[in-house]
């Protein structure tokens, strides 16, 4: 008799999830000497322990504590780059500007980036068919709780000037419901963080508008200012040129506005 299985609205666990997490861990610890002490089998066991045999709508931050402990990692608190809805450019930037870090440049972020996972209550199986969708099913699902937990810690770690890359092509350049808007903004520590500097990335070639005047950016400025953190904003009109100038700052064309 086939066993009844809960059908969720979201995609199932990424295929070869255990192998992917383990392989990523090994690769990361090989590339980053300061993390060579990490036992990747223990990391996988802790990751698995956070969601296996648990109801995928009843996951808590506590479930991820053993994994968080194994993934302890010092990041330069004044070199943190947050992003919202523009992950690829943020990652391209930190690949060039090697002294700056997105969450996905840390071990924990690297392990889980672009992956989906969930289990089932009272069985040791991973659910490859479907996983809960944040909106349609429940917010306390394994993926959402993981990102909320690590994003909160990442924001709490930040100091001095924190940068955030925002997508100027979206209708809501700053979205209160994004991870940045709902978690990271509220966990920046005013005693440590002096300024949040937003980089609004333009999409259109001929787009010369000042998107720093966008109502959602003004909303972000208001939230940040109320938290006693200064706010500044820059338009990045030419993201391609921006990246090129990060690579080659001496280039003569890099003195003009980008």
């Amino acid at each position: 008799v086939p066993r009844w299985r809960q059908q969720w609205s979201g995609p199932g666990t990424t295929k070869r999830f255990p192998e992917t997490v383990l392989a990523r861990c090994v690769k990361y610890t090989e590339i980053h000497p300061e993390m060579r002490h990490v036992d990747c089998q223990s990391v996988w066991d802790a990751f698995k322990g956070a969601f296996i045999s648990k109801h995928p709508c009843n996951i808590t931050e506590e479930d991820y504590q053993p994994l968080m402990k194994l993934g302890t990692q010092t990041v330069p608190c004044n070199k943190i780059l947050l992003w919202s809805r523009i992950k690829d450019l943020a990652h391209q930037f930190t690949q060039v500007q090697r002294d700056m870090f997105t969450l996905e440049d840390t071990l924990l972020g690297y392990l889980a980036d672009d992956l989906t996972w969930c289990g089932e209550f009272n069985t040791s199986k991973i659910n490859y068919q479907s996983c809960p969708d944040w909106r349609k099913d429940c917010s306390n699902n394994p993926v959402s709780v993981f990102w909320k937990t690590v994003s909160r810690r990442f924001a709490e770690a930040a100091c001095d000037v924190v940068h955030v890359m925002l997508n100027g092509s979206r209708s809501k350049i700053f979205d209160k419901n994004s991870t940045f808007g709902s978690v990271e903004v509220h966990n920046l520590q005013p005693e440590k963080v002096q300024t949040l500097e937003a980089w609004v990335i333009h999409g259109g070639r001929e787009d010369s508008r000042d998107l720093c005047q966008d109502p959602t950016i003004k909303e972000l400025e208001s939230i940040i200012s109320k938290r006693n953190i200064q706010f500044s904003c820059k338009n990045i009109y030419r993201p391609d040129k921006f990246l090129q100038c990060v690579k080659n700052p001496e280039d003569s064309s890099c003195t003009s506005e980008i």
Epitope: K69, G71, T72, T74, V75, F154, E156, C159, Q189
Partner: nanobody
Framework: QLQLQESGPGLVKPSETLSLTCTVS??????????WGWIRQPPGKRLELIGS???????YYNPSLKSRVTISVDTSKNQLSLKLSSVTAADTAIYYC????????????????RGQGTLVTVSS
């Protein structure tokens, strides 16, 4: 619940070494669950990180103070210490010791626990 209490002289002469101690209660200073640091706030200015020390003994010092600072722990006394040499009037501040949870991504500035602070004045 962790509690931190700073102690040390309230007055230090210019060019001398400032020495402060922080006694930790409610938890072990040698636990891998925490990292520790010193912060200061000069009159009318923002808080400034002096430096921090991690489980295993590695340290981070604010580049602007690096040549003058030493932070260490005494596990037998459950204490954190700060030494700041060659002080000037610019080192006059309230000095705080601080503790932070040591899991996931962590920075150099522990901010989960903080002592009451102790005022140190540099004057002859």
């Amino acid at each position: 619940q962790l509690q931190l209490q700073e102690s040390g002289p309230g007055l230090v002469k210019p060019s001398e070494t400032l020495s402060l101690t922080c006694t930790v209660s409610g938890g072990s200073i040698s636990s891998s669950s925490y990292y520790w640091g010193w912060i200061r706030q000069p009159p009318g200015k923002r808080l400034e990180l002096i430096g921090s020390i991690y489980y295993g003994g590695s340290t981070y010092y604010n580049p602007s103070l690096k040549s003058r600072v030493t932070i260490s722990v005494d596990t037998s006394k459950n204490q954190l210490s700060l030494k700041l040499s060659s002080v000037t009037a610019a080192d006059t501040a309230i000095y705080y010791c601080a503790g932070g949870y040591n899991y996931g991504p962590v920075g150099q500035w522990p901010s989960d626990y903080r002592g009451q602070g102790t005022l140190v004045t540099v004057s002859s």
